[in-house]
Each structure stands twice: as C-alpha cells, then as structure tokens.
Interface confidence: medium
C-alpha cells in the first residue's frame, strides 16, 4: 500500500478515503513532494505581504512587502517597515547610525561625519546619527569681512570595515 | 594591516578531501558580518560557495555546495574554513576567503569589501 | 539565481564610455544590494561600486552604478588604460535564506 502512494507525484496526495488513490489537490494548497498524505494549504500574501509569486498545485505561493516595507527573516517570514533617517539597513535589519556617522535618507547607508578640519575649516554645528556636521570658517578667517559657514563638504564614502 | 590569507590548496585526487584556511589579521570576528569562500575555475567566472556568520555561527550555501562543502569558523584563531570532500575535476579553482562588509553598527551590508589573493585547489589522478 | 551580463566582452578605447548591464532572475534584496567588482588576470576581485550606486573607497568618479530590482548598469564615462579587466555584478537575495550570486562577467579589452 505504501507504494501505491509513493507514485503519487507532486501536485497531488494520497488519498485514503479513495483506496491511495492520488487526487489533485484542492484549491489554494500544494504539494511540493510527490507521495504526500495530505497538501498543504498555500501561504497567504496580506496586509504588509505582497503576491510575488502566485501558489501552484507544486509550489508555495511567495510574498514580498509593499512599498515602505522589506523583507526580513527566511521566505520573507516578516516585513519591517523601511528604516527612518539616522539609520542604515542591514541583514538583520535597520541599525541605528554609531556616534560619527549620519543617515539623512530613508534609505542608503551611514556616512561618517565630514572631517572639517582637512579643509582647513572648524565645526560651525555638530553632526547628529540625521544630520553631517556644518563646517565653518577657521579660526583664522575669523578676522572683518571673512566669509559666512560654507555648505559642508560631500559626505566620503563610509569605513565599513568591521575593526 | 587588513587582511585575509587563504592557506591549504594544492593537488588533490578526485574523490578525496581538502580543507582550506583563511586566517584574517587586522580584525577580529565579533561581529554580525560574514565571512565567505568564492570560488573561480581557469578562465570563468565567479562563483558564490557560502558563507558564515561571525557572530552566531549561522551558515549559508549554494544549492550545489551543500553537502559536500562545510563551512566552519575558530574565532579565537580568527580563521575561517572551507571542509571540501567527494572532489571532483571541476572542482579545480582559485578559491577566496572574502569579508561581507560591515555596517557603521557591525552588521552585514551584503557585498564584499576585503578578499584573499586566492589558493589553488587541483583536482586530478 | 541566473545574473546575465551583457555583452560577455567588449572591445574599446581608452576615452571611450563603456556601459555593461547585468540582469538578475530574481530582485536582489531591497531593490538595491547589488554590487560591481574589477578583476584583472591573476588578482582578486576589487569593490567598485556597492547598493546599486555607491562608489567605493578610492574608487575614480568615471565609475559610476544605477539601476534597481532586477536590472543594473555599471558605466565608465571615460575608460583609461588601467580599467581593461573584467568587471562582475554581484547579487544578494533572501529567500529560504540569505544568497550571494555574481554575474557572468564583461571582458573589456583594448579595440
């Protein structure tokens, strides 16, 4: 008997009220292997999920999260909301920004601090995990009629290298 | 200085078993980054074999490395491994230990920021 | 996880801009965590571009990435002697689990 239901191929169960006679499997269920007792109800893709790939008699339906949201954990198990400024996205998720480096997108990665002082200038207003610091003048401009706070310098691209 | 030196390639007879080293300096593993091995036959391309997480141990393969590849860490020794059994002639590549780069918080950001100049494994009778 | 990257070889010159695609099967995670690499012969990889359109460290401007989902391109506005090598994008996916995938590579040689 228990051959009859391993002939039993994807796609379908065996199905025991009918003598292990292989049977489709009903509607929103699968089944992935073949010589299965039972099908598995397919996965529901609501609320936060979205339908990637639609369920089969073969295969499990895959969700994806709607926009402002990204998977997390194995098949996309969860979806977090998209990281706010002052944070950068990771494999385990949205990570605040370390103290010297700054985030001022939804998305994309922290960046260090500018270094004012490479360009020979001062700090004017301190960096935030949101916002790069504003490099002013140098002490040394400091003299009548020398120029107001310049825009800070393009963000560099950041250190990732674990320490 | 940053580094990652791969160690233990050479001839090996098909079916028999290698393992490969990757000691890095200049950094230590307690992290939540990986660290993977890439493999790259004479004259194609690159291919992806798996990786480790440093911090929890956690694994992850090509669907064509599992079972006969294993991948294992020491972090005392700050040293990554590559376990190969079951080779065979296509086997033959350079293979590289490559860090996944690291986040600001120490997490892994998915693409590889520092690789090993490569071990050559020869697979033949 | 099929990454296609056209054309498979290139011929140039040095000043000329050079463009290479790289299409993925599937989107790789956030739409965006899709990598280039240089190799020359004998080396290993080299990180130019990361998420899709970020110029790694002491990369040259003339580099540049776009793209999202599951199609990218890597751009070099004006291709220098030193920049013949092959080039490879670089996926990474979660599905059952995290994956890594690199495209078929782009050989760009003197015209």
């Known amino acids: 008997l228990q051959d009859l239901c391993s002939n039993c191929p994807a796609g379908t169960f065996c199905d025991n009220n009918r003598s292990q006679i292989c049977s489709p499997c009903p509607p929103n269920s699968f089944s992935s292997a073949g010589g299965q007792r039972t099908c598995d109800i397919c996965r529901q893709c609501k609320g936060v999920f979205k339908t990637r790939k639609e369920c089969s008699s073969t295969s499990n339906a895959e969700c994806d999260c709607i926009s402002g949201y990204h998977c997390l954990g194995a098949e996309c198990s969860m979806c977090e909301q998209d990281c706010k400024q002052g944070q950068e996205l990771t494999k385990k998720g949205c990570k605040d920004c370390c103290f010297g480096t700054f985030n001022d997108q939804k998305r994309g990665i922290c960046r260090p601090w500018t270094n004012c002082s490479l360009d020979g200038k001062s700090v004017l207003v301190n960096g935030t995990k949101e916002r790069d610091v504003v490099c002013g003048p140098s002490p040394a401009d400091l003299s009548p009629g020398a120029s107001s706070a310049t825009p800070p310098a393009p963000a560099r691209e950041p250190g990732h290298s674990p320490q | 200085e940053v580094q990652l030196v791969e160690s233990g390639g050479g001839l090996v007879q098909p079916g028999g078993s290698l393992r490969l080293s990757c000691a890095a300096s200049?950094?230590?593993?307690?992290?939540?980054?990986?660290m993977c091995w890439v493999r790259q036959a004479p004259g194609k391309g690159l291919e992806w074999i798996g990786c480790?997480?440093?911090?929890?141990?956690?694994?992850y393969y090509a669907s064509w490395a599992k079972g006969r590849f294993t991948i294992s860490r020491d972090n005392s020794k700050n040293t990554v491994y590559l376990q190969m059994n079951s080779l065979r002639a296509e086997d033959t590549a350079v293979y590289y230990c490559?860090?996944?780069?690291?986040?600001?918080?120490?997490?892994?950001?998915?693409?590889?920021?520092?690789w090993g100049q490569g071990t050559l494994v020869t697979v033949s009778s | 996880i099929q990454m296609t990257q056209s054309p498979s070889s290139l011929s140039a010159s040095v000043g000329d801009r050079v463009t290479i695609t790289c299409q993925s099967s599937?989107?790789?995670?956030?739409?965006?965590?899709l990598a280039w690499y240089q190799q020359k012969p004998g080396k290993a990889p080299k990180l130019l571009i990361y998420r899709a359109s970020n110029l790694a460290s002491g990369v040259p401007s003339r580099f540049s990435g776009s793209g999202s989902g599951t199609d990218f391109t890597l751009t070099i506005s004006s291709l220098q002697p030193e920049d013949f090598a092959t080039y490879y994008c670089?996926?990474?996916?979660?599905?059952?689990?995290?994956?890594?995938?690199f495209g078929t590579g782009t050989k760009v040689t003197v015209l």
């Open positions: 480790i997480d440093t911090g929890d141990g956690s694994t």
């Open positions: 490559a860090r996944e780069a690291a986040s600001s918080s120490g997490y892994g950001m998915g693409y590889f920021d520092l």
């Open positions: 599937q989107s790789v995670y956030d739409n965006n965590w």
């Open positions: 670089q996926g990474t996916y979660l599905s059952s689990n995290w994956y890594w995938a």
């Open positions: 200049g950094f230590s593993f307690n992290n939540d980054y990986d």
